[in-house]
């Protein structure tokens, strides 16, 4: 038992927020300022991420967890852990190499990020157009032409199994 204990890595006892200091006979030392260790048994502490420039601090660094960044207003996060910030555009626009450009006719973007997408082609789905699309919003398709023919019933369909939840009225 004694032998097993002596063979055990003493660094494994060092908790998160500390590191196993080789310069001090493998004593567990607290992470220095602006560094952290998120797991036990670490031989070094990692340098805290600094949220500078277009990044802003969402969560401060602590001895056991890294700082988390997001983007300043007018920008949005891209990549894992918000590794990049990309400029926002207005709804109805998309970001190009030359900056924000309005969506071309027949396309829309209902967000401040991403690309313009084509309006739904209602007729491809056997539907008519209820409301035309805009740069900021897709078309709303309406009833199928068959529903509009003389003699078609206007009975409300049966209740859906699960009620949808979309834009509030």
């Amino acid at each position: 038992f004694e032998r097993t204990r002596s063979l055990q890595d003493p660094c494994s006892n060092c908790p998160a927020g500390t590191f196993c200091d080789n310069n001090r006979n493998q004593i567990c030392s607290p992470c220095p300022p602006n560094s952290f260790s998120s797991a036990g048994g670490q031989r070094t502490c990692d340098i805290c991420r600094q949220c500078k420039g277009v990044f802003r601090t969402r969560k401060e660094c602590s001895s056991t967890s890294n700082a988390e960044c997001d983007c300043t207003p007018g920008f949005h996060c891209l990549g894992a852990g918000c590794s990049m910030c990309e400029q926002d555009c207005k709804q109805g626009q998309e970001l190009t190499k030359k900056g924000c450009k309005d969506c071309c006719f027949g396309t829309f973007n209902d967000q401040k990020r991403g690309i313009c997408r084509p309006w739904t082609n209602c007729s491809l789905d056997g539907k008519s157009v209820l409301v035309n699309g805009t740069k900021e919003r897709d078309v709303v398709c309406g009833p199928s032409p068959a529903d509009l023919s003389p003699g078609a019933s206007s009975v409300t369909p049966p209740a859906p199994a699960r009620e949808p939840g979309h834009s509030p009225q």
């Epitope: 739904t120 209602c122 491809l124 789905d125 539907k127 209820l130 409301v131 805009t134 919003r137 897709d138 078309v139 709303v140 398709c141 309406g142 009833p143 529903d147 409300t156 369909p157 859906p160 699960r162 009620e163 949808p164 939840g165 979309h166 834009s167 509030p168 009225q169």
Partner: nanobody, 125 residues
Amino acid sequence: QVQLVESGGGVVQPGRSLRLSCAASGSTFSIVAMGWYRQAPGKQRELVASIITGDGDTNYADSVKGRFTISRDNSKNTMYLQMNSLKPEDTAVYYCYARTGYGSSWLMGHEYDYWGQGTQVTVSS
């Protein structure tokens, strides 16, 4: 489920006005757009006017532009059609219609169209 009930139809002389109402009840939170359709005897049902419930954006059939106005009161879950300068050719059954979901299809492949039972509008001298 969404229920739609129209009211305000009737007989009116040419040149006069009428206001139709469509009261929605049930899962009105899911409605993204509403419209008024009309159907004259033996004819196809046609779109008269439509409105996005969120931003109030409207569309009109050419035949009613400048005469009809569609509007909504979201607090009352009611849509209106103000019909001015009525003509005999406006005579039809007017139906309220509601749509849940943009594009043509709904989340998880479902789609929902809701109709009212209709209200008769007769323009005659």
